[in-house]
Interface confidence: medium
Amino acid sequence: YFGKLESKLSIIRNLNDQVLFIDQGNRPLFEDMTDSDCRDNAPRTIFIINMYKDSQPRGMAVAISVKCEKISTLSCENRIISFKEMNPPDNIKDTKSDIIFFQRSVPGHDNKMQFESSSYEGYFLACEKERDLYKLILKKKDELGDRSIMFTVQNED
């Protein structure tokens, strides 16, 4: 069971300082941006981190959404990352959800975060280069210190 607690506006970056944004095709991508680029591209660069309490204490549960024309929420259904047109619900009566991730700081790296899927244990949000695009994907954690699954989250409130 997950119960929504509060929401914060955030900018999410990978460790190469590229900014996460949602493109016109609703794809989550990373790109080099200056602070002014980041502002100019809002709201596509501003993510709503919806925080939930978890009835099984597994950490800080979050759903990540973005509000452009409509609200879309990040999903890892079938281990594929996509934004689905939906509001994060107030309550989720299940122990797993495709839209719920556990946000945890990386031990020894206070300001770096990782996001583990509640549906697929051991799978994390990651940044992966595919041709010329830096994509947000779901990746099985396979090594210690994997920088691709680490992010910084800048609070915009």
């Epitope: 925080m51 204490p57 597994r58 800080m60 107030d90 700081s105 609070n155």
Partner: antibody
Framework: QVQLLESGGGLVQPGGSLRLSCAAS????????IHWVRQAPGKGLEWVSV????????YYADSVKGRFTISRDNSKNTLYLQMNSLRAEDTAVYYC???????????WGQGTLVTVSS | DIQMTQSPSSLSASVGDRVTITCRAS??????LNWYQQKPGKAPKLLIY???TLQSGVPSRFSGSGSGTDFTLTISSLQPEDFATYYC?????????FGQGTKVEIK
């Protein structure tokens, strides 16, 4: 700047009721979960309750469940704690506190004293 | 519910001393633990969140460590203004729980 101001404390008899208020300013009230935390005289901190930013979810410590009700009016930027069936052990300073993204209680009110005594 | 056991309940130390306070959770809370300082008649002040992240404006002599069930707050060189009561708080579960507190007094 962020401010939280509690009111409504006072002396009440065992079995009585009291409603505490917490007026908030300096931030987008509806975006934040707000907590009540209490401290009995000379004792430690005890978490009491929290309400979600939109007001749809509430959680309570076992010691107050069924007797206390947390609520909020986002149009008035105000948090409430309705306390019924009060007991002597509810005597405490009651603080409202705002959380930050890591759930750190980063802003606190100055507290309001509730005394339950006959 | 998750219980937090904080120790010691009080300690006496001198300015310049290294002070260590521990908190133990009844089950794993990952790194979801905060440390607070409280002075008499005042509201608590957040020192450290997520077990080891120093809150902005807090002196670097304060540090936190630990993950899972065992956590430590360390003051590397105690200063006169550090004499106070310290609390841990877990926020992993549905309910939040404070430790019992540690009063740091002047020796």
């Amino acid at each position: 700047q962020v401010q939280l101001l509690e009111s409504g404390g006072g002396l009440v008899q065992p079995g009585g009721s009291l409603r505490l208020s917490c007026a908030a300013s300096g931030f987008t009230f509806s975006s934040y979960a707000i907590h009540w935390v209490r401290q009995a005289p000379g004792k430690g901190l005890e978490w009491v309750s929290v309400i979600s930013g939109e007001g749809s979810n509430t959680y309570y410590a076992d010691s107050v469940k069924g007797r206390f009700t947390i609520s909020r009016d986002n149009s008035k930027n105000t948090l409430y704690l309705q306390m019924n069936s009060l007991r002597a052990e509810d005597t405490a300073v009651y603080y409202c506190a705002r959380v930050m993204i890591g759930y750190g209680f980063d802003y606190w009110g100055q507290g309001t004293l509730v005394t339950v005594s006959s | 519910d998750i219980q937090m056991t904080q120790s010691p309940s009080s300690l006496s130390a001198s300015v310049g001393d290294r002070v260590t306070i521990t908190c133990r959770a009844s089950q794993s809370i990952f790194n979801y633990l905060n440390w607070y300082q409280q002075k008499p008649g005042k509201a608590p002040k957040l020192l450290i969140y997520d077990s080891s992240t120093l809150q902005s404006g807090v002196p670097s002599r304060f540090s936190g460590s630990g993950s899972g069930t065992d956590f430590t707050l360390t003051i590397s060189s105690l200063q006169p203004e550090d004499f106070a009561t310290y609390y841990c708080l877990q926020y992993s579960g549905f309910l939040f729980t404070f430790g019992q507190g540690t009063k740091v007094e002047i020796k």
